[in-house]
């Protein structure tokens, strides 16, 4: 014969374990119902009655299955240098990220800290490494036969047109000028632009620690806002 | 104890660069972050930037972005702090202090002059 | 960026009376983490300054008691119960909420 389904609550087997989405409630000693996600326990079982589950109240949640007298509050809103990427439901928390253009600086368990606009590269610098969730742009000085003309967090150093006959030839912050007749592209990198890193939720683990250095720092260690000599600019 | 001990007094011509250093010890350096303030003769308080020592993230005043840069160097538990292109007006008192969340311990203080 | 504005600027007091600094923040100070970040500082003549109050309301370790905070949002006092000598100085309120993180402009303390 198969063994008979027991219906919560009901007593476990000596030394026996109660089943997915139940919990055995010391008082009563008996395993008993969880709360679906969004609920949470109203009142607790008896060794008559089962648990009695009942709907988190605005602005709080339960995100798994639970028997927690109270649901859990949503955090506080989203500073003004976040937007909210998941709202506050019965199920879920907030989640607060940093703004499209900005990079989380500094990382908490509970989120993002601290949110800090990622580094424009000015002309005649392009962005040698670009930004990530947690880590600013790098800039780097355009190479010789390479420019870019833009104030960028986006944009990389491109190749000068090759002329026939050079008008005005090209520098770091500019293209060169042709002659009349049609010009080309010498073959450097294609990539002219690059995207926005797309702002999901914020990670909590820190990024792995860059090499810290003195003053006099080389181009591409990303310790604080790049001199002018390094290419980057503010607003 | 915590303690944070800037480097010395310095006289500079305008258009010249000064870097202050600021040396903890007393606590895991790497774990917290360093703000500088300044504070010119008889003024207030003025924020010029913070960085991570864990990771070098940074960020500065709108106002200094294109002429300070902040380092940090985990081995010797210092940071630094680079003002390029100097006027007359970056005469202050620089201090640099731990934290983000708030700043509990602050170094002593450089008095940097800019005069020709 | 987040203005704080203190009031008063200067503020005459009693040996042995309250003292009371206000400060208000141009936008909320709460963060989404659900602390609010904003400290007071003591400045003493020809010092460093000191933080006496972080989180609004928590005294730093060695601070005396009668150094006391409070506020929410936007609106923050800084309450001193019995002004002792040693309190004359300038007090400021500082936010490390979000970036730039900013200062009042400053209280003077001084004895009548």
């Known amino acids: 014969l198969p063994a008979q389904v027991a219906f919560t609550p009901y007593a476990p087997e000596p030394g026996g374990t109660c089943r997915l989405r139940e919990y055995y409630d010391q008082t009563a000693q008996m395993c008993c119902s969880k709360c679906p996600p969004g609920q949470h326990a109203k009142v607790f079982c008896t060794k008559t009655s089962d648990t009695v589950c009942d709907s988190c109240e605005d602005s709080t949640y339960t995100q798994l299955w639970n028997w927690v007298p109270e649901c859990l509050s949503c955090g506080s809103r989203c500073s003004s240098d976040q937007v909210e990427t998941q709202a506050c439901t019965r199920e879920q928390n907030r989640i607060c990220t940093c703004r499209p253009g900005w990079y989380c600086a500094l990382s908490k368990q509970e989120g993002c800290r601290l949110c800090a606009q990622l580094r424009k590269c000015r002309p005649g610098f392009g962005v040698a490494r670009p930004g990530t969730e947690t880590s600013d742009v790098v800039c780097k000085p355009c190479a010789p036969g390479t420019f870019s003309n833009t104030t960028s967090s986006t944009d990389i150093c491109r190749p000068h047109q090759i002329c026939h006959v050079v008008a005005i030839p090209g520098n770091a912050s500019m293209d060169a000028v042709c002659t009349s007749t049609s010009p080309t592209r010498s073959m450097a990198p294609g990539a002219v632009h690059l995207p926005q890193p797309v702002s999901t939720r914020s990670q909590h683990t820190q990024p792995t620690p860059a090499p810290s250095t003195a003053p006099g720092t080389s181009f591409l260690l990303p310790v604080g806002p790049s001199p002018p000599a390094e290419g980057s600019t503010g607003d | 104890q915590v303690q944070l001990v800037q480097s010395g007094a310095e006289v500079k011509k305008p258009g010249a660069s000064v870097t202050v250093s600021c040396k903890a010890s007393?606590?895991?350096?790497?774990?917290?972050?360093i703000i500088w303030v300044r504070q010119a003769p008889g003024q207030g308080l003025e924020w010029m930037g913070w960085?991570?020592?864990?990771?070098?993230?940074?960020n500065s005043a709108q106002k200094l972005q294109d002429r300070v840069t902040m380092t940090t160097d985990t081995s010797t538990s210092t940071a630094y702090m680079e003002l390029r292109s100097l006027r007359s007006d970056d005469t202050a008192v620089y201090y640099c202090?731990?934290?983000?969340?708030?700043?509990?311990?602050w170094g002593q203080g450089t008095l940097v002059t800019v005069s020709s | 960026d987040i203005v704080m504005t203190q009031t008063p600027l200067s503020s005459p007091v009693t040996l042995g009376q309250p003292a009371s600094i206000s400060c208000r923040s141009s936008?909320?100070?709460?963060?989404?983490?659900?602390?609010?970040?904003l400290s007071w500082l003591q400045q003493r003549p020809g010092q460093p300054p000191r933080l006496l109050i972080y989180k609004v309301s928590s005294r730093f370790s060695g601070v005396p008691d009668r150094f006391s905070g409070s506020g929410a949002g936007t609106d923050f006092t800084l309450k001193i119960s019995r002004v002792e000598a040693e309190d004359v100085g300038v007090y400021y309120c500082?936010?490390?909420?979000?970036?730039?993180?900013?200062f009042g402009r400053g209280t003077k303390l001084e004895i009548k």
């Open positions: 500082t936010q490390s909420t979000q970036f730039p993180f900013t």
């Open positions: 960085i991570s020592a864990f990771n070098g993230n940074a």
């Open positions: 007393g606590y895991t350096f790497s774990t917290y972050g």
């Open positions: 936008q909320s100070l709460v963060h989404s983490d659900g602390n609010t970040y």
């Open positions: 202090a731990r934290g983000e969340d708030f700043f509990d311990y």
